[in-house]
Interface confidence: medium
């Protein structure tokens, strides 16, 4: 889910990201791998570069919360809303929240964190939902094997519309 009006993009190439806390049922190393793979999906097709930081502020802040968590967009327990992210032009740019009450995994059990993170980070980069079912920005969760996952042409076109191609420099 994307939150707040916003048509902006990030006006820089290099974005930092930080994983602030972790879910109950996934090893921190697996969470780190999932988030790393998710940001890499987007950097592979744009000029964007993502750098993980361990402390302090970051452009993209990933965290796990449950129920109401003081951003006005409460989670709803297992199932339902899996996560939400704020668009770059919102009051909370780069904030990515996942529902702590989901069963997160790096496989096909529960909800695959890599897939949901790729979707939410898409929002945090400025992408809206897509009605194209093959798009990672489709609003309903669909499982794909993360090892063979690829962005759809629709995803690539829209993210490059914002940031340009990998070898281009369409950011001012």
């Amino acid at each position: 889910t994307s939150i707040s009006p916003g048509r902006c993009k990030w006006n820089k190439h290099t974005l930092t990201y930080r994983i602030i806390n972790y879910p109950h049922d996934m090893k921190p190393s697996a969470v780190k791998d999932s988030i790393y793979n998710a940001v890499s999906i987007w950097s592979n097709v744009t000029p964007l570069i993502f750098q993980q930081v361990q402390n302090g502020d970051a452009d993209i802040k990933v965290s796990f919360w449950q129920w109401a968590h003081e951003d006005g967009w409460p989670f709803d327990g297992p199932g339902g809303i899996l996560g939400h992210a704020f668009l770059p032009n919102s009051g909370n740019p780069g904030v990515v929240h996942f529902d702590k009450n989901e069963h997160w995994s790096a496989s096909d059990t529960g909800y695959n964190l890599f897939l949901v993170a790729t979707h939410e980070i898409g929002h945090s980069l400025g992408l809206q939902h897509s009605g194209n079912q093959s798009s990672i920005m489709y609003p309903t969760y669909w499982y794909h094997d993360p090892r063979t996952f690829q962005l759809s042409a629709d995803d690539i076109q829209r993210i490059q519309h914002l940031y340009g191609e990998k070898c281009s420099s369409d950011i001012p």
């Epitope: 048509r7 897509s130 490059q160 914002l162 340009g164 281009s168 420099s169």
Partner: antibody, heavy 119, light 110 residues
Amino acid sequence: EVQLLESGGGLVQPGGSLRLSCAASGFTFSQYWMNWVRQAPGKGLEWVSGIGPSGGITYYADSVKGRFTISRDNSKNTLYLQMNSLRAEDTAVYYCARGEEDGYNSDYWGQGTLVTVSS
Amino acid sequence: QSELTQPPSASGSPGQSVTISCTGTSSDVGAYNYVSWYQQHPGKAPKLIIYEVNKRPSGVPDRFSASKSGNTASLTVSGLQAEDEADYYCNSYAGSNSLIFGGGTKLTVL
């Protein structure tokens, strides 16, 4: 104040070529998507082409693909549309329009330049 | 498809409300929230009045509102005024790096 001023329109024979220009001022040209949109006499609007801020990405309507080329010179704050192999159905007022940051809608438009393709 | 479907004309008396529809497909209007509306007075350039389905640029009166349901977008002009008489065009991103306009609706204030 944002201003867009198109030029280069005129009468051309079928099969001929024309280059339209759009001089931009009042904003940082190099930061915005730009579009060309046309309107045949008495008809509706038709999107023609779009170009990314640095010129690295270009889009075209199927009706002009392979015949028209969009380009820009950010040092001159100018947008161009090179039109080749012109047809009677290309007759229209051509508007230059500034794209919003996502590029999918246009918030400022020029007053247009008329292109007439006729023998 | 080459064009979104709009009614060719609509009308209303001053002070009334008028709604203009814009019907596309699941590949354009239904697929994205990139729907915008333009107002064009005779002999003038189009003016953006709605973007991203229902957002108004600054300076556009709140008499103009819009929404989307499924493959159909709608523009409502409430409290009609004489200066609202114009042509109105909807526009949508249509995937594959293309944009598509509606055929236009001529709004007459009676």
